[in-house]
Protein backbone atom coordinates (compact mmCIF):
# COMPACT_ATOMS: atom_id res chain seq x y z
CA UNK A 1 0.00 0.00 0.00
CA UNK A 2 1.24 3.53 -0.79
CA UNK A 3 1.21 5.34 2.54
CA UNK A 4 1.52 8.74 0.84
CA UNK A 5 -1.59 8.24 -1.24
CA UNK A 6 -3.51 7.15 1.84
CA UNK A 7 -2.28 10.27 3.66
CA UNK A 8 -3.49 12.43 0.77
CA UNK A 9 -6.90 10.78 0.87
CA UNK A 10 -7.10 11.49 4.59
CA UNK A 11 -5.92 15.06 4.03
CA UNK A 12 -8.60 15.82 1.44
CA UNK A 13 -11.25 14.25 3.68
CA UNK A 14 -10.12 16.38 6.61
CA UNK A 15 -10.36 19.58 4.58
CA UNK A 16 -14.00 18.81 3.76
CA UNK A 17 -14.79 17.82 7.33
CA UNK A 18 -13.06 20.92 8.72
CA UNK A 19 -15.12 23.22 6.47
CA UNK A 20 -18.31 21.44 7.54
CA UNK A 21 -17.31 21.86 11.20
CA UNK A 22 -16.73 25.58 10.71
CA UNK A 23 -20.11 25.94 8.97
CA UNK A 24 -21.95 24.00 11.70
CA UNK A 25 -20.32 26.07 14.44
CA UNK A 26 -21.17 29.34 12.68
CA UNK A 27 -24.81 28.25 12.39
CA UNK A 28 -24.93 27.76 16.17
CA UNK A 29 -24.54 31.54 16.50
CA UNK A 30 -27.74 32.16 14.55
CA UNK A 31 -30.60 30.13 16.05
CA UNK A 32 -33.48 29.97 13.59
CA UNK A 33 -31.35 32.16 11.29
CA UNK A 34 -31.56 35.19 13.60
CA UNK A 35 -28.73 37.41 14.80
CA UNK A 36 -30.42 38.93 17.87
CA UNK A 37 -29.54 36.10 20.27
CA UNK A 38 -25.81 36.38 19.63
CA UNK A 39 -25.91 40.15 20.15
CA UNK A 40 -27.95 39.71 23.37
CA UNK A 41 -25.58 36.94 24.54
CA UNK A 42 -28.46 34.46 24.71
CA UNK A 43 -26.48 31.52 23.34
CA UNK A 44 -25.30 28.32 25.01
CA UNK A 45 -21.95 28.78 26.75
CA UNK A 46 -20.49 25.92 24.70
CA UNK A 47 -21.13 27.82 21.47
CA UNK A 48 -18.47 30.29 22.64
CA UNK A 49 -15.82 27.55 22.93
CA UNK A 50 -15.37 27.70 19.11
CA UNK A 51 -15.05 23.92 19.05
CA UNK A 52 -16.07 23.61 15.41
CA UNK A 53 -14.31 26.72 14.18
CA UNK A 54 -11.00 26.14 16.00
CA UNK A 55 -10.89 22.52 17.17
CA UNK A 56 -12.59 20.72 14.31
CA UNK A 57 -11.91 23.46 11.78
CA UNK A 58 -8.80 25.63 11.63
CA UNK A 59 -6.71 23.28 13.77
CA UNK A 60 -7.66 20.43 11.45
CA UNK A 61 -6.49 22.25 8.31
CA UNK A 62 -2.84 22.13 9.45
CA UNK A 63 -2.59 18.30 9.47
CA UNK A 64 -4.84 18.13 6.41
CA UNK A 65 -2.43 20.17 4.27
CA UNK A 66 0.56 18.29 5.70
CA UNK A 67 -1.05 14.99 4.67
CA UNK A 68 -1.93 16.28 1.21
CA UNK A 69 1.66 17.41 0.68
CA UNK A 70 3.06 13.95 1.43
CA UNK A 71 1.99 12.21 -1.77
CA UNK A 72 3.99 12.85 -4.94
CA UNK A 73 4.14 11.03 -8.26
CA UNK A 74 7.61 9.68 -7.48
CA UNK A 75 6.59 8.37 -4.09
CA UNK A 76 8.05 4.92 -4.34
CA UNK A 77 11.29 4.14 -2.60
CA UNK A 78 11.89 0.80 -0.94
CA UNK A 79 12.49 -0.08 2.68
CA UNK A 80 14.73 2.81 3.59
CA UNK A 81 17.14 2.57 0.63
CA UNK A 82 15.79 5.71 -1.05
CA UNK A 83 13.72 8.80 -0.23
CA UNK A 84 14.88 9.09 3.35
CA UNK A 85 13.43 12.63 3.37
CA UNK A 86 10.00 11.29 2.58
CA UNK A 87 10.24 8.78 5.39
CA UNK A 88 11.05 11.66 7.73
CA UNK A 89 8.06 13.52 6.31
CA UNK A 90 5.82 10.53 6.99
CA UNK A 91 7.07 10.37 10.56
CA UNK A 92 6.59 14.13 11.00
CA UNK A 93 3.04 13.72 9.69
CA UNK A 94 2.44 11.72 12.87
CA UNK A 95 3.04 14.94 14.81
CA UNK A 96 0.54 16.76 12.57
CA UNK A 97 -1.92 13.92 13.10
CA UNK A 98 -1.54 14.29 16.88
CA UNK A 99 -2.43 17.98 16.54
CA UNK A 100 -5.47 16.84 14.57
CA UNK A 101 -6.38 14.36 17.29
CA UNK A 102 -6.20 17.16 19.87
CA UNK A 103 -8.39 19.47 17.75
CA UNK A 104 -10.98 16.85 16.90
CA UNK A 105 -10.96 15.59 20.50
CA UNK A 106 -11.68 19.12 21.69
CA UNK A 107 -14.51 19.41 19.16
CA UNK A 108 -16.04 16.10 20.30
CA UNK A 109 -15.80 16.91 24.01
CA UNK A 110 -17.32 20.39 23.68
CA UNK A 111 -20.09 19.13 21.38
CA UNK A 112 -20.90 16.33 23.83
CA UNK A 113 -21.03 18.83 26.72
CA UNK A 114 -23.21 21.15 24.65
CA UNK A 115 -25.61 18.31 23.91
CA UNK A 116 -25.70 17.17 27.54
CA UNK A 117 -26.37 20.64 28.95
CA UNK A 118 -28.90 21.68 26.34
CA UNK A 119 -29.54 25.18 25.04
CA UNK A 120 -29.87 28.47 26.84
CA UNK A 121 -33.47 29.46 26.27
CA UNK A 122 -36.36 31.48 27.60
CA UNK A 123 -38.07 28.85 29.72
CA UNK A 124 -41.70 28.31 30.65
CA UNK A 125 -41.28 30.73 33.56
CA UNK A 126 -39.97 33.49 31.31
CA UNK A 127 -36.37 33.23 32.48
CA UNK A 128 -33.24 32.74 30.36
CA UNK A 129 -32.04 29.41 31.66
CA UNK A 130 -30.31 26.13 30.86
CA UNK A 131 -33.68 24.44 31.13
CA UNK A 132 -32.40 20.89 30.56
CA UNK A 133 -29.07 21.08 32.41
CA UNK A 134 -30.38 19.04 35.33
CA UNK A 135 -31.73 16.23 33.13
CA UNK A 136 -28.23 14.84 32.43
CA UNK A 137 -29.02 14.60 28.73
CA UNK A 138 -32.30 12.72 29.22
CA UNK A 139 -34.15 15.54 27.46
CA UNK A 140 -32.70 14.21 24.21
CA UNK A 141 -34.95 11.17 24.53
CA UNK A 142 -38.07 13.07 25.59
CA UNK A 143 -38.99 15.51 22.83
CA UNK A 144 -42.23 16.41 24.60
CA UNK A 145 -40.20 18.51 27.04
CA UNK A 146 -38.67 20.61 24.28
CA UNK A 147 -41.64 22.99 24.29
CA UNK A 148 -40.39 24.17 27.71
CA UNK A 149 -38.15 26.46 25.66
CA UNK A 150 -40.30 29.27 24.33
CA UNK A 151 -37.50 31.22 22.65
CA UNK A 152 -35.55 31.11 20.34
CA UNK A 153 -37.98 29.23 18.13
CA UNK A 154 -36.93 25.58 17.60
CA UNK A 155 -33.78 26.20 19.66
CA UNK A 156 -33.64 22.65 21.03
CA UNK A 157 -33.84 21.12 17.55
CA UNK A 158 -31.27 23.65 16.32
CA UNK A 159 -28.79 22.95 19.11
CA UNK A 160 -29.26 19.18 19.11
CA UNK A 161 -28.84 18.96 15.32
CA UNK A 162 -25.75 21.14 15.10
CA UNK A 163 -23.98 19.80 18.19
CA UNK A 164 -24.72 16.26 16.95
CA UNK A 165 -23.21 17.16 13.58
CA UNK A 166 -20.13 18.59 15.32
CA UNK A 167 -19.90 15.46 17.46
CA UNK A 168 -20.08 13.20 14.40
CA UNK A 169 -17.68 15.28 12.29
CA UNK A 170 -15.22 15.57 15.17
CA UNK A 171 -15.46 11.82 15.71
CA UNK A 172 -14.70 11.09 12.04
CA UNK A 173 -11.79 13.56 12.11
CA UNK A 174 -10.46 11.87 15.25
CA UNK A 175 -10.60 8.42 13.58
CA UNK A 176 -8.93 9.72 10.39
CA UNK A 177 -6.13 11.34 12.36
CA UNK A 178 -5.70 8.13 14.34
CA UNK A 179 -5.46 6.20 11.06
CA UNK A 180 -2.83 8.68 9.87
CA UNK A 181 -0.81 8.15 13.05
CA UNK A 182 -0.69 4.42 12.22
CA UNK A 183 -0.17 5.17 8.52
CA UNK A 184 2.63 7.62 9.29
CA UNK A 185 4.42 5.28 11.66
CA UNK A 186 4.20 2.38 9.17
CA UNK A 187 5.20 4.63 6.28
CA UNK A 188 8.14 5.99 8.17
CA UNK A 189 9.39 2.65 9.46
CA UNK A 190 8.62 0.30 6.56
CA UNK A 191 9.35 2.76 3.82
CA UNK A 192 7.39 5.25 1.83
CA UNK A 193 6.10 2.52 -0.49
CA UNK A 194 6.75 -1.15 -0.16
CA UNK A 195 7.41 -1.96 -3.78
CA UNK A 196 7.38 -0.57 -7.32
CA UNK A 197 4.94 -3.27 -8.36
CA UNK A 198 2.24 -2.71 -5.75
CA UNK A 199 0.54 0.65 -5.31
CA UNK A 200 -2.95 0.96 -4.00
CA UNK A 201 -5.09 4.01 -3.51
CA UNK A 202 -6.60 3.96 -0.06
Amino acid sequence: MCYGKCARCIGHSLVGLALLCIAANILLYFPNGETKYASENHLSRFVWFFSGIVGGGLLMLLPAFVFIGLEQDDCCGCCGHENCGKRCAMLSSVLAALIGIAGSGYCVIVAALGLAEGPLCLDSLGQWNYTFASTEGQYLLDTSTWSECTEPKHIVEWNVSLFSILLALGGIEFILCLIQVINGVLGGICGFCCSHQQQYDC
Partner: antibody
Framework: EVQLVQSGAEVKKPGASVKVSCKAS????????VKWVRQAPGQGLEWMGW????????IYAADFKGRVTMTTDTSTSTAYMELRSLRSDDTAVYYC?????????????WGQGTLVTVSS | EIVLTQSPATLSLSPGERATLSCRAN?????INWYQQKPGQAPRLLIY???NLASGIPARFSGSGSGRDFTLTISSLEPEDFAVYYC?????????FGGGTKVEIK
Protein backbone atom coordinates in the same frame (compact mmCIF):
# COMPACT_ATOMS: atom_id res chain seq x y z
CA GLU B 1 -49.15 55.53 26.95
CA VAL B 2 -48.61 51.82 27.50
CA GLN B 3 -51.93 50.02 27.57
CA LEU B 4 -53.77 46.80 26.86
CA VAL B 5 -57.34 47.09 25.59
CA GLN B 6 -59.55 44.00 25.77
CA SER B 7 -62.68 43.05 23.90
CA GLY B 8 -66.11 43.50 25.47
CA ALA B 9 -68.14 41.32 27.80
CA GLU B 10 -69.49 38.01 26.54
CA VAL B 11 -72.40 35.78 27.53
CA LYS B 12 -72.03 32.13 26.52
CA LYS B 13 -73.88 28.87 26.97
CA PRO B 14 -72.21 25.84 28.59
CA GLY B 15 -70.19 23.85 26.05
CA ALA B 16 -69.58 26.90 23.85
CA SER B 17 -66.28 28.69 23.22
CA VAL B 18 -65.17 32.25 23.84
CA LYS B 19 -62.33 34.19 22.25
CA VAL B 20 -61.05 37.28 24.07
CA SER B 21 -58.77 39.76 22.32
CA CYS B 22 -56.17 42.05 23.86
CA LYS B 23 -54.70 44.90 21.80
CA ALA B 24 -51.39 46.34 22.96
CA SER B 25 -50.16 49.86 22.32
CA UNK B 26 -47.40 52.18 23.51
CA UNK B 27 -44.60 49.60 23.50
CA UNK B 28 -42.89 47.02 21.29
CA UNK B 29 -45.32 44.13 21.42
CA UNK B 30 -42.78 41.36 20.76
CA UNK B 31 -40.44 42.47 23.57
CA UNK B 32 -42.82 41.25 26.28
CA UNK B 33 -44.94 38.18 26.88
CA VAL B 34 -48.69 38.24 27.42
CA LYS B 35 -50.13 36.33 30.35
CA TRP B 36 -53.76 35.55 30.94
CA VAL B 37 -55.22 35.64 34.43
CA ARG B 38 -58.83 35.15 35.45
CA GLN B 39 -60.83 36.13 38.52
CA ALA B 40 -64.12 34.49 39.40
CA PRO B 41 -66.68 36.78 41.12
CA GLY B 42 -65.52 37.55 44.66
CA GLN B 43 -62.54 35.20 44.27
CA GLY B 44 -58.78 35.46 43.91
CA LEU B 45 -56.56 35.49 40.83
CA GLU B 46 -55.83 32.38 38.76
CA TRP B 47 -53.04 32.11 36.19
CA MET B 48 -54.06 30.46 32.92
CA GLY B 49 -50.84 30.60 30.93
CA TRP B 50 -48.81 32.90 28.75
CA UNK B 51 -47.59 33.34 25.22
CA UNK B 52 -44.19 34.38 23.92
CA UNK B 53 -45.21 37.13 21.51
CA UNK B 54 -41.92 36.95 19.58
CA UNK B 55 -42.06 33.25 18.74
CA UNK B 56 -45.75 32.56 19.28
CA UNK B 57 -44.95 29.69 21.65
CA UNK B 58 -47.56 29.30 24.40
CA ILE B 59 -47.26 27.82 27.89
CA TYR B 60 -50.51 26.67 29.48
CA ALA B 61 -51.34 26.03 33.11
CA ALA B 62 -52.08 22.33 33.66
CA ASP B 63 -55.68 23.05 34.69
CA PHE B 64 -56.42 24.59 31.28
CA LYS B 65 -54.37 22.38 28.95
CA GLY B 66 -56.44 21.04 26.09
CA ARG B 67 -59.15 23.63 26.65
CA VAL B 68 -57.32 26.90 26.08
CA THR B 69 -55.48 28.28 23.04
CA MET B 70 -53.38 31.42 23.15
CA THR B 71 -52.31 33.11 19.92
CA THR B 72 -50.94 36.44 18.74
CA ASP B 73 -51.14 38.62 15.66
CA THR B 74 -47.95 40.67 15.65
CA SER B 75 -49.12 42.79 12.70
CA THR B 76 -51.85 44.27 14.89
CA SER B 77 -50.07 43.80 18.27
CA THR B 78 -52.99 41.72 19.48
CA ALA B 79 -53.08 38.65 21.71
CA TYR B 80 -55.99 36.22 21.78
CA MET B 81 -57.19 33.70 24.32
CA GLU B 82 -59.78 31.11 23.33
CA LEU B 83 -61.41 28.94 26.00
CA ARG B 84 -63.47 25.97 24.84
CA SER B 85 -66.04 23.67 26.46
CA LEU B 86 -67.19 26.41 28.78
CA ARG B 87 -68.70 25.51 32.14
CA SER B 88 -70.57 27.64 34.64
CA ASP B 89 -67.46 27.84 36.83
CA ASP B 90 -65.64 29.55 33.95
CA THR B 91 -67.70 32.65 34.70
CA ALA B 92 -65.03 35.21 35.52
CA VAL B 93 -63.27 38.39 34.53
CA TYR B 94 -60.40 37.50 32.17
CA TYR B 95 -57.36 39.76 32.19
CA CYS B 96 -54.50 39.95 29.73
CA UNK B 97 -51.30 41.21 31.30
CA UNK B 98 -47.99 42.38 29.93
CA UNK B 99 -45.28 40.09 31.20
CA UNK B 100 -41.71 41.21 31.80
CA UNK B 101 -39.09 38.50 31.14
CA UNK B 102 -35.91 38.09 33.17
CA UNK B 103 -34.75 37.39 36.70
CA UNK B 104 -37.59 39.52 38.06
CA UNK B 105 -40.76 38.46 36.30
CA UNK B 106 -43.84 40.51 36.89
CA UNK B 107 -47.16 41.66 35.46
CA UNK B 108 -46.75 45.42 35.09
CA UNK B 109 -49.55 46.40 32.71
CA TRP B 110 -53.05 44.93 32.93
CA GLY B 111 -55.96 45.05 30.52
CA GLN B 112 -59.26 46.38 31.82
CA GLY B 113 -60.66 42.85 31.97
CA THR B 114 -63.35 41.01 29.99
CA LEU B 115 -66.31 39.57 31.85
CA VAL B 116 -67.31 36.17 30.49
CA THR B 117 -70.61 34.87 31.81
CA VAL B 118 -71.45 31.22 31.23
CA SER B 119 -75.13 30.56 31.76
CA SER B 120 -77.76 28.29 30.30
CA GLU C 1 -47.80 23.53 43.20
CA ILE C 2 -46.63 26.32 45.50
CA VAL C 3 -49.44 27.51 47.77
CA LEU C 4 -49.30 31.06 49.10
CA THR C 5 -51.22 31.80 52.28
CA GLN C 6 -51.92 35.44 53.07
CA SER C 7 -52.72 36.69 56.55
CA PRO C 8 -54.72 38.21 57.92
CA ALA C 9 -57.63 37.76 55.52
CA THR C 10 -58.92 41.18 56.59
CA LEU C 11 -57.05 44.02 58.20
CA SER C 12 -59.07 46.87 59.77
CA LEU C 13 -57.01 50.01 60.21
CA SER C 14 -57.38 53.78 60.25
CA PRO C 15 -55.68 56.21 57.85
CA GLY C 16 -52.18 57.09 59.05
CA GLU C 17 -51.65 53.67 60.67
CA ARG C 18 -48.99 51.17 59.65
CA ALA C 19 -50.16 48.05 57.80
CA THR C 20 -48.21 44.79 57.77
CA LEU C 21 -49.38 42.09 55.40
CA SER C 22 -47.94 38.58 55.45
CA CYS C 23 -47.52 36.03 52.66
CA ARG C 24 -46.28 32.53 53.50
CA ALA C 25 -45.29 29.86 50.96
CA ASN C 26 -45.54 26.11 51.59
CA UNK C 27 -42.00 25.72 50.20
CA UNK C 28 -39.02 27.98 49.64
CA UNK C 29 -39.22 30.48 46.79
CA UNK C 30 -36.85 33.08 45.36
CA UNK C 31 -38.98 36.19 45.01
CA ILE C 32 -42.55 37.39 45.11
CA ASN C 33 -44.56 40.24 43.63
CA TRP C 34 -47.32 42.25 45.33
CA TYR C 35 -50.43 43.62 43.62
CA GLN C 36 -53.17 45.99 44.75
CA GLN C 37 -56.75 45.65 43.52
CA LYS C 38 -59.60 48.05 44.07
CA PRO C 39 -63.26 47.11 43.45
CA GLY C 40 -64.13 47.00 39.75
CA GLN C 41 -60.52 47.57 38.68
CA ALA C 42 -57.69 45.42 37.39
CA PRO C 43 -54.86 44.64 39.80
CA ARG C 44 -51.87 46.98 39.85
CA LEU C 45 -48.24 46.00 40.39
CA LEU C 46 -46.80 47.45 43.62
CA ILE C 47 -43.65 45.48 44.41
CA TYR C 48 -41.64 43.13 42.19
CA UNK C 49 -38.77 40.85 43.12
CA UNK C 50 -39.78 40.94 46.81
CA UNK C 51 -38.48 44.44 47.57
CA ASN C 52 -38.41 46.55 44.38
CA LEU C 53 -40.91 49.36 44.08
CA ALA C 54 -42.79 49.40 40.76
CA SER C 55 -42.86 52.55 38.65
CA GLY C 56 -45.17 55.25 40.01
CA ILE C 57 -45.75 53.55 43.38
CA PRO C 58 -45.34 55.76 46.48
CA ALA C 59 -42.41 55.11 48.82
CA ARG C 60 -44.74 54.29 51.73
CA PHE C 61 -45.02 50.79 50.22
CA SER C 62 -42.15 48.40 50.91
CA GLY C 63 -41.55 44.69 50.65
CA SER C 64 -39.25 42.27 52.43
CA GLY C 65 -38.69 38.60 53.18
CA SER C 66 -37.04 35.49 51.82
CA GLY C 67 -37.48 31.74 51.65
CA ARG C 68 -41.03 31.09 52.81
CA ASP C 69 -42.05 34.29 54.60
CA PHE C 70 -42.66 37.61 52.88
CA THR C 71 -44.10 40.92 54.07
CA LEU C 72 -45.68 43.98 52.49
CA THR C 73 -45.59 47.08 54.67
CA ILE C 74 -47.52 50.30 54.19
CA SER C 75 -45.84 52.78 56.52
CA SER C 76 -48.75 55.21 56.78
CA LEU C 77 -52.10 54.34 55.25
CA GLU C 78 -53.67 56.84 52.88
CA PRO C 79 -57.40 56.74 52.02
CA GLU C 80 -56.60 55.38 48.54
CA ASP C 81 -54.67 52.42 50.02
CA PHE C 82 -57.80 50.62 51.24
CA ALA C 83 -58.02 47.71 48.81
CA VAL C 84 -57.25 44.02 48.41
CA TYR C 85 -53.57 43.00 48.21
CA TYR C 86 -52.29 39.85 46.52
CA CYS C 87 -48.87 38.22 46.62
CA UNK C 88 -47.69 36.13 43.66
CA UNK C 89 -44.79 33.71 43.19
CA UNK C 90 -42.92 32.99 39.96
CA UNK C 91 -40.40 30.39 41.09
CA UNK C 92 -42.27 27.46 39.56
CA UNK C 93 -45.22 26.66 37.34
CA UNK C 94 -48.07 27.09 37.81
CA UNK C 95 -47.62 30.70 38.85
CA UNK C 96 -49.79 31.16 41.91
CA PHE C 97 -51.37 34.01 43.82
CA GLY C 98 -52.21 34.26 47.48
CA GLY C 99 -55.86 34.42 48.52
CA GLY C 100 -55.57 38.14 49.21
CA THR C 101 -55.68 40.44 52.22
CA LYS C 102 -58.41 43.04 52.37
CA VAL C 103 -57.32 46.28 54.03
CA GLU C 104 -60.45 48.09 55.16
CA ILE C 105 -61.16 51.30 57.01
CA LYS C 106 -61.73 50.77 60.71
Amino acid sequence: EVQLVQSGAEVKKPGASVKVSCKASGYTFTNYGVKWVRQAPGQGLEWMGWINTYTGNPIYAADFKGRVTMTTDTSTSTAYMELRSLRSDDTAVYYCVRFQYGDYRYFDVWGQGTLVTVSS
Amino acid sequence: EIVLTQSPATLSLSPGERATLSCRANSGISFINWYQQKPGQAPRLLIYGTANLASGIPARFSGSGSGRDFTLTISSLEPEDFAVYYCQQYSSNPLTFGGGTKVEIK
